[in-house]
Interface confidence: medium
């Protein structure tokens, strides 16, 4: 059964864009006019999870690529990764838990909490050119993003 997908660009609250730096890593950096098209477009799928007034379960794929953000435990720490999937099977309504994020809207911003690891969020660093990672909202890490809709 086809599932609903919408396409977005994400920027953190410092207006850093997200780019694919090697096959399996996202980085956050400021882009200027001529290289603005380097930023990735996310395919957001509405998937199995527990929706509520303020949380919507979604999966985040990279448009045009068989890659999804997923959350796994590595060396005892919840970790964000880009995972390659079978394009014949994904996206699907019932994604494995590691692919599910609770999209939380806070005023005009949005946060993405791991469903597998509550209170861990897709995060960026204050510094430029650093990997996007899974953080527990501590210190100076950025967890608030803006979403720019992209026509399909």
């Amino acid at each position: 059964v086809p599932i609903r997908q919408l396409h977005y660009r994400l920027r953190d609250e410092q207006q850093k864009s997200l780019v694919l730096s090697d096959p399996y890593e996202l980085k956050a950096l400021h882009l200027n006019g001529q290289n603005i098209n380097q930023q990735v477009i996310f395919s957001m799928s509405f998937v199995q999870g527990e929706p509520s007034n303020d949380k919507i379960p979604v999966a985040l794929g990279l448009k045009g690529k068989n890659l999804y953000l997923s959350c796994v435990m590595k060396d005892g720490t919840p970790t964000l990764q880009l995972e390659s999937v079978d394009p014949k099977q994904y996206p699907k309504k019932k994604m494995e838990k590691r692919f599910v994020f609770n999209k939380i809207e806070v005023k005009s911003k949005v946060e993405f909490e791991s469903a597998e690891f509550p209170n861990w969020y897709i995060s960026t660093s204050q510094a430029e050119h650093k990997p996007v990672f899974l953080g527990n909202n501590s210190g100076q890490d950025i967890i608030d993003f803006t979403m720019e809709s992209v026509s399909s």
């Epitope: 059964v1 086809p2 199995q48 099977q89 494995e96 590691r98």
Partner: antibody, heavy 119, light 106 residues
Framework: QVQLQQWGAGLLKPSETLSLTCAVY????????WSWIRQPPGKGLEWIGE???????NYNPSLKSRVTISVDTSRNQFSLSLSSVTAADTAVYYC?????????????WGQGTLVTVSS | QSVLTQPPSVSVSPGQTASITCSGD??????AFWYQQKPGQSPVLVIY???KRPSGIPERFSGSNSGNTATLTISGTQALDEADYYC?????????FGGGTKLTVL
Amino acid sequence: QVQLQQWGAGLLKPSETLSLTCAVYGGSFSDYYWSWIRQPPGKGLEWIGEIDHSGSTNYNPSLKSRVTISVDTSRNQFSLSLSSVTAADTAVYYCARASPSSGWTLDYWGQGTLVTVSS
Amino acid sequence: QSVLTQPPSVSVSPGQTASITCSGDKLGDKFAFWYQQKPGQSPVLVIYLDNKRPSGIPERFSGSNSGNTATLTISGTQALDEADYYCYAWADTYEVFGGGTKLTVL
């Protein structure tokens, strides 16, 4: 309160086609998935398949070649057709709703219809 | 086809804790659900998304799911909890029920 009411022929001969319909009363039809499940006498539950309001379907691979699930959104109804039945298809057949608020699982069920296949 | 395995029967004394397991390959990667079915009745959802209770389901019902095993736990089991219990999950594009466990309250 949501209610699912189902009906259809209860006695079939081998090789005939089973046909059941489920009507949905209360609640939106388009916001959910609609499923069929069966349970042979004294045995466990078996998921048959599902459909959404647009007519997109998923089927159990073991039954896929014989099953058709269809939808009539104007009547808030969906139907099951199972061809070339044998005695092994004797079961109570349930219709059910899969809801996003319960993680896309089956939260409301019909009353069940016993279908017997016998020559 | 994917398989979810449950013990055929579990017995418990009133007031005690009953645990019903459901095992399947990498089941913890997916969400597990549990249904209660009493004789002659349609199944009723008692646990969804591993560990959440629908409204109207008593607090004594709880669930967990990790590794290859999902577990339904009924604490302070009552006579009215005697029923068949089915776990339920999905396998790629289709849904799978466990074989069912008959819970007997002695």
